[in-house]
């Protein structure tokens, strides 16, 4: 029980060390204020006094999913919960990815000099492209986008006539332009990709990171339509710059990217010189708030950069475009299709104190961690929630930016579910009604939540006693402890006030009143109480677990003597004088064990003397110093000196016999034997 | 209007005693405690001790433990301190004051003050 | 016990000018601490409470500031009233402990 061993000053320090802690405010209460609930009730705390963190989950916005609408859709899409730190919560999730959803597919393509045939190639795939689009949706648009790198040194050549016109029959260097935002007009797209002309720059790595940015976050220029699928194809046959690589040290330009929207009223992106590019999180995460799929198109050249960099975008494509992008087509349909059938949902905007894992029955997940859908069904997927106690060594309620925030559980292709998320790390309010120095702390101290707080130099239950110096907890400390009253309890003014209603007691709480002897599981066999460690008995018992009548009735014999005078009566049992001749009950005589062989040395004699068979048989019995009689009921085994029985092997029945007397076989002893043996069936 | 009044200034013998008393009007007597302080000719002001008039328990600074005794008289809003064995260093000014069951706010009202006088 | 230094013990000064008196404690007293002023017809009345909060009726020139050990009152501008003996006292532990006074007279 972590509550109770948690070294605990206040009720808000209680609460906050376990999710299970509880508080008691009881002024009467004398036990430990921190423990759980339910112990708490059963040291005798009021439930009202009790102060808990109650944990809250509520779904504020739930449309149930539609699977006649041909969009995606996520179910519930708002809720609120608070948790206590270390606690968890389990919720559902519907998702549902319709079989047919409108795409937005927009091609960013790289613009430097290399890039020529590709561009021609494209140039004549357009009517190619549209067909391929047509075969997986009926609702799609189509945009297209450019770019190079900076136009700044080291990327660029700055030379006047250069920027002009970098290569022969080329286009000035730029960053990066939306050429055509996204349009179902097919043919708009063709005849405007007709008089691109291609461009160039002087380092090989592109500013392609740059434009993948600006077409996440400029969702009006581009013209993302909410519910529709978000496919960017990058184009390249080049690495890429990223956040910090050393070219833009170079260049002079040192900003982070502010990650918004620059571009001006002809599409071309304007702060290439004061920004730097982004990183590669920064893209993963701006792509996943916008609902943006990746497929990059790369050729043999450069595929082993995006090989890694592809793995970090949780759905995504890559594959190998051919020299002059002739299999770009082939590559899209490839692509889409992969992607159609895996569905990432992860948690954006999370507070570090707070920890989001979704699970699926009815899904496998991927190597990536997406799961495989099947598409037209509702998917059901378990989210669990929990709210961490420590963040790097610290608990989690000293850090409060880490504390809540809007959690965004989103799936690749929709808006997703918004978390209003947080732990809870109140105060106890009634740590906010503390009676400032109060009469019933001696006005040495605050009363707070049911106990006194005590002014430095003051202790107590109600702050009276002067404390000074550690010579005040010595009368507490038994010799060789190191805790005051063993723990199991307050030092108060120089003696020791236990815990536990009574169930410590002593000078320093060292007897521990659950811990007397027991007897079948009872303390003190139930017929006592435990006091100083020690058994107290009722009336009537004594013994060190109170297991010992004082009554002599067990012991009384038939005859309505002790022990048949053979023995004394000592905690309700006979001792016997000559234990090993006596039954251990009440002292009568146990012939067995005066005579361990007698039936042995009775058996041949009987059965030559009865039933003429046996070792003696065909000698006379005349050796057997002792009389048999033949009897039809032999007397119970109690009743008797022995009683035993053989069997014959002549005729294979079991005979039976007892002594009587004092067990000394002789003249005067007879053996009574039963007339009738104990044949088996059919002999 | 809040007041508490305080007896006339006494002039005693060394060894005697002498009882002072302090009356409480315009609030409720039982509603707070009620404190002793003494403050010797040109010296700075002393805790005595305080009494809660609803119970009667006391509670004593250790310097004047055997020599105030409070107690009160709740039927006419009085407080009472008794100072015995009474010798010169016992001459002062004594006041009384109220102080809240709790709270920021210690001593809000005070009384005139009584000088004690011991001389042969 | 808790010591209450008081300085200065008397202090000479003019009408409208800005005093300040200090006052600090043998040990933290978590701002538990009252100024009261003695006229000299021996009647007290409290000025400030908990180290900074007016008491109801005192004019808006008096006040007092300090945390830990060390606290202060201030008059603003010195009114005729004014000049009178003025005591700190820490309610924080008892014994409830007054410090030594300072004196406040006209120049």
């Known amino acids: 029980n972590r509550c109770k061993k948690a070294p605990v000053k206040s009720c808000t320090e209680c609460v906050r060390v376990d999710k299970d802690c509880a508080y008691c405010t009881d002024e009467m209460f004398r036990d430990r204020r921190c423990n759980t609930q339910a112990e708490l009730l059963a040291a005798g705390c009021q439930r009202e006094s009790i102060v808990v963190m109650e944990s809250s989950f509520q779904i504020t916005e739930e449309t149930q999913i539609d699977t006649t609408l041909r969009r995606s859709q996520m179910s519930p899409q708002g809720l609120r919960v608070r948790l206590r730190p270390g606690e968890e919560r389990h919720f559902e999730l519907e998702v549902f990815e319709p079989l047919e959803s409108p795409v937005d597919l927009y091609i960013l393509m790289d613009f430097s000099n290399s890039m020529s045939d590709d561009l021609d190639n494209l140039k004549k795939m357009g009517q190619n492209l549209a067909r391929v689009l047509s075969q997986l949706t009926s609702d799609y648009t189509i945009g297209f986008g450019k770019f190079v790198d900076k136009v700044s040194v080291p990327q660029t050549d700055m030379r006047p006539e250069k920027l002009k016109e970098p290569w022969p029959n080329s286009d000035p260097p730029f960053s990066f332009k939306n050429v055509i935002s996204l349009t179902e007009d097919v043919d708009e797209f063709r005849n405007k990709l007709q008089g691109e002309r291609i461009s160039g720059n002087l380092d090989a790595p592109e500013g392609g990171f740059d434009a993948i940015l600006q077409t996440a976050v400029c969702t009006r220029d581009i013209g993302w339509r909410p519910d529709s699928t978000h496919l960017l194809v990058f184009s390249t046959e080049s690495a890429f710059h990223y956040e910090a690589d050393g070219a833009n040290v170079l260049a002079g330009i040192m900003s982070r990217n502010d990650e918004r929207c620059h571009l001006d009223t002809t599409g071309t992106y304007t702060q290439y010189r004061t920004q730097d590019y982004p990183s590669v999180p920064t893209l993963v995460r701006l792509l996943a708030k916008h609902n943006i799929i990746p497929i990059f198109a790369v050729t043999n050249y450069s595929y082993s950069y995006y090989e890694k960099l592809h793995t970090y975008f949780p759905v995504s494509s890559l594959g190998v475009l051919q020299e002059d992008s002739s299999n770009i087509v082939e590559l899209l349909e490839e692509a889409f299709n992969r992607i159609r059938s895996n569905l990432d949902i992860r948690a954006l905007d999370s507070p570090r104190g707070l920890r989001t894992e979704v699970t699926s029955k009815m899904f496998q997940k991927t190597r990536t961690g997406s799961f495989h859908i099947r598409r037209g069904e509702v998917g059901i997927y378990q989210v669990q929630l929990r709210a961490l106690e420590h963040v790097d060594g610290t608990h989690v309620c000293q850090l409060p930016e880490d504390q809540k925030g809007n959690i965004h559980l989103k799936p690749s292709f929709s808006d997703g579910l918004k978390m209003d998320a947080g732990i809870i790390c109140d105060v106890c309010t009634c740590e906010l009604q503390k009676e400032v120095r109060s009469a019933r702390c001696s006005f040495n101290g605050d009363f707070v939540c049911g106990q006194c707080v005590c002014s430095e130099g003051w202790s107590g239950q109600t702050c009276n006693c002067s404390t000074g110096s550690l010579s005040d907890i010595q009368p507490c400390l038994r010799e060789g402890e190191d805790k005051p009253c063993s723990g199991r309890g307050e030092c108060q003014c120089g003696h020791c006030v236990c815990y536990g209603e009574g169930r410590y007691e002593g000078q320093f709480c060292e007897y521990d009143n659950f811990q007397c002897p027991r007897t079948s599981g009872f303390l003190c066999n139930d017929r006592g109480r435990c006091s100083m460690g020690q058994c107290v008995c009722e009336p009537g018992w004594t013994g060190p677990s109170c297991d010992c009548p004082l009554s002599n009735a067990t012991c009384i014999d038939s005859n309505g003597g002790i022990c048949n005078g053979r023995g004394h009566c000592e905690c309700g049992r006979c001792h016997c004088h000559q234990q090993s001749l006596y039954t251990d009950t009440i002292c009568e005589i146990n012939y067995s064990a005066i005579h361990p062989g007698l039936c042995e040395d009775l058996r041949s004699c009987v059965q030559c003397q009865a039933w003429g068979t046996g070792e003696k048989k065909g000698r006379t019995c005349e050796e057997c110093n002792f009389k048999v009689k033949m009897v039809d009921e032999l007397k119970r085994a109690e009743e008797v000196v022995v009683r035993c029985s053989f069997r014959d092997e002549d005729d294979d029945c079991t005979y039976s016999y007892t002594m009587e007397g004092d067990g000394a076989p002789g003249p005067n002893s007879t053996v009574l034997v039963h007339k009738k043996k104990d044949c088996p069936p059919g002999s | 209007q809040v007041n508490l009044l305080q007896s006339g200034a006494a002039l005693v013998k060394p060894g005697a005693s002498v009882k002072l008393s302090c009356k409480a009007s315009g609030y409720t007597f039982t509603d707070y405690y009620i404190f002793w302080v003494k403050q010797s000719h040109g010296k700075s002001l002393e805790w005595i001790g305080y009494?809660?008039?609803?119970?009667?328990?006391?509670n004593y600074n250790e310097k004047f433990k055997r020599k105030a005794t409070l107690s009160v008289d709740k039927s006419t809003n009085t407080a009472y301190m008794e100072l015995s064995r009474l010798t010169s260093e016992d001459s002062a000014t004594y006041y009384c004051t109220r102080r809240a069951y709790y709270g920021y706010n210690p001593f809000d009202y005070w009384g005139q003050g009584v000088m004690v006088t011991v001389s042969s | 016990d808790i010591q209450m230094t008081q300085t200065p013990s008397s202090m000479p000064a003019s009408l409208g000018e800005r005093v300040t008196i200090s006052c600090r404690a043998s040990?933290?007293?978590?701002?538990?601490l009252s100024w009261y002023q003695q006229n000299l017809d021996g009647t007290i009345k409290p000025l400030i409470y908990?180290?900074?909060n007016l008491q109801s009726g005192v004019p808006s020139r008096f006040s007092g500031s300090g945390s830990g050990t060390d606290y202060s009152l201030t008059i603003s501008s010195l009114e005729p009233e004014d000049f009178a003996m003025y005591y700190c006292q820490q309610y924080d532990s008892s014994p409830w402990t007054f410090g030594g006074g300072t004196k406040l007279e006209l120049k």
């Open positions: 908990y180290t900074s």
């Open positions: 009494i809660n008039p609803n119970s009667g328990s006391t």
């Open positions: 040990r933290g007293i978590n701002n538990y």
